[in-house]
Each structure stands twice: as C-alpha cells, then as structure tokens.
C-alpha cells in the first residue's frame, strides 16, 4: 500500500517520488537513461516511456552520446550567419540559446498573478515563477518575450525579479507556440517537476536540487555537456578557464547571484548557493551583487584557492574541515575521507578499500573527535560545506556500486574534487 496520510507517492528503485514528478531513470550499466522519462502518476504508479524525438531538419543528423535525440551536426553553416550558442534539449524538444518558452504545472505554490517562464541559456534550462504586472485593460495580449500578457501598447516588459521569485528546471513543457495561459487562471492542482536524482558534479546532465522550499530563490538546473575542445568553458559568449567561477547571466533574469557556475575542465557545473539560517552578527545586510546577506564591517579572510570569512563561512555557508588518509599495503589501497562537524561534534569517516582498481569494501563510521585525533595518516585537505558534502555522498553511493563490479581508476579522486570550494570570480558568491 503506497498511500500514507492521503499523500500518494511513488517508489522507484528505493527512491521516493512525488506525484507529478518526472525523472530519467538511473539504470545499470548505462547510468542515466536520457531516452526514457518516468513520471509518478496520481495512483502511485510509475509510468516510464521513451522520449519522442523531434524531426531533425538536416541530411545526416548525428547521435551524441549522453543525449537522447539525434541532432544536426554543429559543423553545419549557421542559419542566418548568426553565431550559434549551445542549445537546450528538453523533453525531446530542442530550444535555441536565448529562446523563451512557457511551462505549465511546475509550481504548486503558483499565485493567480504568476506564470512560469523558461529560458534556454548556454545549454541550461532555467524556469522561474514570474509575477505579472496588474492589467488595466479588458483584452490583454500575449508577447513573444514573456509568459505574462500585457496591455496593447505597454511596451517591453522589464525582467526584474523580486526576492520571492522561484526558479526551477521544468518537468513538463507546453507546446512551443501554445497560447499563453492567462495569469488569472486558477493555479494547477497537480505539482510536477523534479529531476533525476544524481549528483550534479558527476553527471553528464547534473541535477541540482533544493530540498527545503523556503522563501528566496529555488534553483534547479539541467546541464547539457556537449563535447568541446580545449580546457575551457564557454558561457554567454565568455570563455572561462578550468577552476574559474561565475554567475550565469540569463537573458530572462539578468545575473543570477544565487547560482554559481564553475568550469571543471570543459564542463560547466552550476550549483545553488545556500545562505545560512543564522549569521554571526545581529543585523546582516543585503549587498548588491551578492546572493547572501553579509555581516557589516567583516573582511573576508582568504585561504589558498578558497574564500572564507573569519567564522569559517564560504559564500555565507558554514564550512567544515575535510581530512584524507591514503594507506597502501599488499597491493590494497585504503582511502579514508573524513568530515569533522560541530553539530553533532563528531567525525564521519568514509573508508574505501580498493584492490586492482576494484572496490573490495566501503563503509562509513562515525567517531568522536578525540578518537579521530589519535588516528594516524590523516591530513587536512580542504574545508567544505554541507551542500557539497551531500553532493559528495550521493556521488559516492553511485560509484561505490559501480566500482564494485568494474575497474575504477580516478572516479574517487574526481569525486573528492567536489569538496574543494573554488575561489569565486572577483570574490563574489
């Protein structure tokens, strides 16, 4: 029986999904199967089906690994001689960079005067709840650049967004040229949304999910990584080298301060910045260009490659020390990653035993700080945030399964990199 307290949900491979939630299943040995969409139906059943691919208008479409639908080769002469930016694939439909579209049924808490605006920017789909201006005319009209309807002659809408606006990656998509919904329609009764549950930093199309839907900005991003040459990332026409960070600049929303993108070799990895619930001062202030409030008069003390303030915060989020120990004996490598926390005061040690590249044993132990201090071989490698640790542990769960049945050489080392907090661009978060 799957109904509890009149709240229906679905179970798929030991994970819980809300009614209306959609995701790509994670299936061995392929990983995320992008050609299959699953949805949690009202009766608690999961329905999965193959993505229907749109017709491509070229003679020899190419099939790119990790993308479902074939597409026209990038080498084709661009239409109208415009420089082509990275497009977005969503639900079997390709959107061009800068293209805006409307999604329905995404937000449970959509107000009657709000609509869902989605935008494709450099391969990422961003959706936001847009608060529409009050209409003063009887017959408002739709405009191409907004999900809100406007009065004739009102001119172009500004794209300011209030603190209460919510962004989300879409789960379902209205027909590309559908008639925009009136913002006085009742909000949709069913909630959709949600992404494949896979840590963003390690997947080809990462999902960054915010669990607590509190006030402020909720961000979900899907990253389509096409193969690029050279050790750089290109975003919004700008080139970033490995390790550089920036805030995405979206045509629809301007600079999104609460999302930080980092160039990891050639992959753009974006994540939501979590602001702390408590600050070390009584009256933190909101500063232009920063996502989180800051305490006045505090100068940030910088560690190599990382930006922390004197209370051990990184971009407003508390940080904790990460230790590592690597011990080799009789052809067996024991690698330990440890996170020291204050609440509760303990050390969480993740132990990996690897022989000839195959994972022999993986376990987690929680020990007191005193006990930890007596353990040999550990050295401090970085400080990290709880949100990065969460991404690390999710990725760890995936690769612990994967590496027990096949040879893994760099997977764990690559995953540990998630814990390193890069210095953000110009010291901004």
């Amino acid at each position: 029986e799957q109904v509890k307290h009149s709240e229906t949900y679905c179970m798929f491979q030991d994970k819980k999904y809300r009614v209306g939630e959609r995701w790509h299943p994670y299936l061995e040995p392929y990983g995320l199967v992008y050609c299959v969409n699953c949805i949690c139906s009202e009766n608690g059943n999961v329905l999965c089906s193959r993505v229907r691919c749109p017709n491509v208008h070229c003679l020899s479409p190419v099939h790119i690994p990790h993308l479902c639908c074939p597409r026209c080769p990038d080498s084709l002469p661009p239409v109208n001689n415009k420089v082509t930016s990275k497009s977005c694939e969503y639900n079997g439909t390709t959107y061009q960079h800068g293209e805006l579209f409307v999604a329905e049924g995404l937000f449970q808490n959509r107000q009657p005067n709000q609509c869902t605006q989605c935008s494709c920017s450099e391969g990422n789909v961003y959706c936001g709840l847009k608060t529409c201006p009050k209409l003063t005319c009887a017959f408002p009209v739709s405009v191409p650049d907004s999900c809100c309807r406007v009065c004739r002659g009102d001119g172009e809408l500004s794209w300011e967004h209030s603190d209460g606006d919510i962004f989300r990656q879409p789960a379902n998509r209205e027909a590309r040229h559908s008639y925009h919904r009136s913002h006085y329609d009742p909000p949709p009764s069913r909630q959709a949304g949600g992404l494949s549950r896979f840590p963003g930093a390690r997947s080809h199309r990462g999902a960054l999910m915010d669990s607590q839907q509190a006030s402020g900005t909720i961000v979900q991003i899907v990253i389509n990584n096409k193969h690029k040459h050279g050790q750089v990332c290109v975003s919004n026409g700008k080139t970033y080298s490995h390790g550089e960070s920036w805030h995405p600049n979206l045509r629809a929303f301007g600079i999104v301060e609460c999302v930080l993108c980092t160039c990891n070799v050639t992959k753009q990895e974006c994540k939501k910045i979590h602001c702390p619930n408590r600050y070390p001062c009584k009256y933190p202030q909101k500063i232009d260009g920063k996502c989180c409030k800051v305490c006045p008069g505090k100068k940030a003390k910088e560690l190599p490659g990382q930006s922390f303030d004197n209370k051990g915060y990184f971009c407003g989020e508390e940080t904790m020390p990460v230790y590592e120990s690597v011990f080799m004996e009789d052809g067996e490598t024991t690698r330990k990653i440890a996170l020291e926390t204050e609440r509760p005061p303990q050390v969480e040690v993740h132990v990996w035993t690897i022989r000839k590249g195959i994972l022999q044993h993986f376990h987690i132990e929680k020990i007191s700080k005193r006990m930890f201090e007596e353990l040999p071989h550990f050295k401090l490698v970085t400080r990290t945030t709880l949100s990065q640790w969460k991404i690390f542990t999710e990725g760890e769960a995936q690769i612990s399964q994967m590496c027990s049945s096949r040879v893994c050489r760099t997977e764990l080392e690559d995953l540990v990199k998630v814990l390193y907090l890069e210095r953000s661009e110009k010291g901004h978060c």
Partner: antibody, heavy 118, light 107 residues
C-alpha cells in the same frame, strides 16, 4: 545494419567446458551491453547476465555465476560466454542480444545450440 | 527474484480477432516491461518495451499497456503471421526474468 553473429552448434561431453561467441557489427561495439539468454528445448527464456564493453562491467544472474563466464575482445567486437562443468541441464539454445541505450533488447543473435551428451 | 506470470499458456483465436495476453509481476516493476514474439526455430523479436513503447518496425496492431504489477499485450486484429509464442520480461531489477510464455494458436 546491426547484426549479432553467434558461433555454431556444439556437442560436448559432461564435465567439459564450451566457449560460445557473439560477434557484433553495424554499430559502435563499446556503446551497448550484450546480454545472454538461455532457452531449454520447449521451455521459456532465462537471463544469464550481461557484459558491457564500454566499461568492462559484468552482471550475472546468481543462478549462473558459477556456470557462465563472460568476456570480450574489443578488437574483434566479440563477446564470449564460457560454460563450465557441463551437465545435461546445460543442454539448450543460448542467445546473445544487444541492449539498446533506452533499455530494450532490440537485436538478437540466431542462437547457439549446446548439447551435452556422453 | 521477481516472478513474471503469464496465466495462459495457450490462447486460441481467429484471424481478425482482438486478443489480449496478460502478464503479472510478483512486485511493482514500474513499467520496466518488454514483450517478445518468438516463432519456432527463430530468435525472440522485440515488440514492446517500457510497457507501451512499440519497437521500430512493429505493426501498430500491437499495443502494450499496464503499470504496477499488471501488464497486457493486445493485438487488435490478429493476422496469420502473429501465431507465435509471446513472452513478457521485466528489467526493473536483476536478475531480469521472463514470463513462461503464451502460445497464440488458431482455433
């Protein structure tokens, strides 16, 4: 076009081993998993396991873990299944099949008949 | 292991009839179900996957449906060439398992 060509019929003695092959063509060998399925005469289908040339990942049905060994040769785009300590219970037709990226066994080999008899 | 049960070992039908072959899983398999057709002396041939997606080249008289534990393969108008063995298979969890098969025969 996609093809899976399996080796010819085998007549083997009890206790011996046999190595069946499945040669893939018409697609990128390392991108798809090859599965093996057993069918005894007049009976249903039983899944033995898979080999994924892309990563070397192997998954066995526990029932066949001590019976079958899956290997591959990337240079010839061939997956092998070795059956050991054969008994009359192992007399069957063995099929190899390709698992598409969207999780469908879309192409099958013609099958290899193995007869265990003294 | 998940057990896939095809309750009818044989089904008699006439050309032009509509026929439904059923398959029941011992637990929820979340539409991770495929249907195969096998003719004597041949390899199985994929018809339907993910419970309802018709494989390329399969005539549209074949449709798949179902969710949870109950799945159905329907042939809307049986043709002579459809007389064969039909197997359902789950790929929700390993070991992947097949139903015992349903043989479609002419009355």
């Amino acid at each position: 076009q996609v093809q899976l060509q399996q080796s010819g019929a085998e007549l083997v003695k009890p206790g011996a081993s046999v190595k069946l092959s499945c040669k893939a063509s018409g697609y990128t060998f390392t991108e798809y998993t090859i599965h093996w399925v057993k069918q005894r005469s007049g009976q249903g289908l039983e899944w033995i396991g898979w080999f994924y040339p892309g990563s070397g990942s192997i998954k066995y049905n526990e029932k066949f873990r001590d019976k079958a060994t899956l290997t591959a040769d990337k240079s010839s785009s061939t997956v092998y299944m070795e059956l050991s300590r054969l008994t009359s219970e192992d007399s069957a037709v063995y099929f190899c099949a390709r698992l598409d990226r969207d999780y469908a066994m879309d192409y099958w080999g013609q099958g290899t008949s193995v007869t265990v008899s003294s | 292991d998940i057990v896939m049960t095809q309750s009818h070992k044989f089904m008699s039908t006439s050309v032009g009839d509509r026929v439904s072959i059923t398959c029941k899983a011992s637990q929820d398999v979340s539409t991770a179900v495929a249907w195969y057709q096998q003719k004597p002396g041949q390899s199985p041939k994929l018809l339907i996957y993910w419970a309802s997606t018709r494989h390329t080249g399969v005539p549209d008289r074949f449709t798949g449906s179902g969710s949870g534990t109950d799945y159905t393969l329907t042939i809307s108008s049986v043709q002579a060439e459809d007389l064969a063995l039909y197997y359902c298979q789950q790929h929700y969890s390993t070991p992947w398992t097949f139903g015992g098969g349903t043989k479609l025969e002419i009355k």
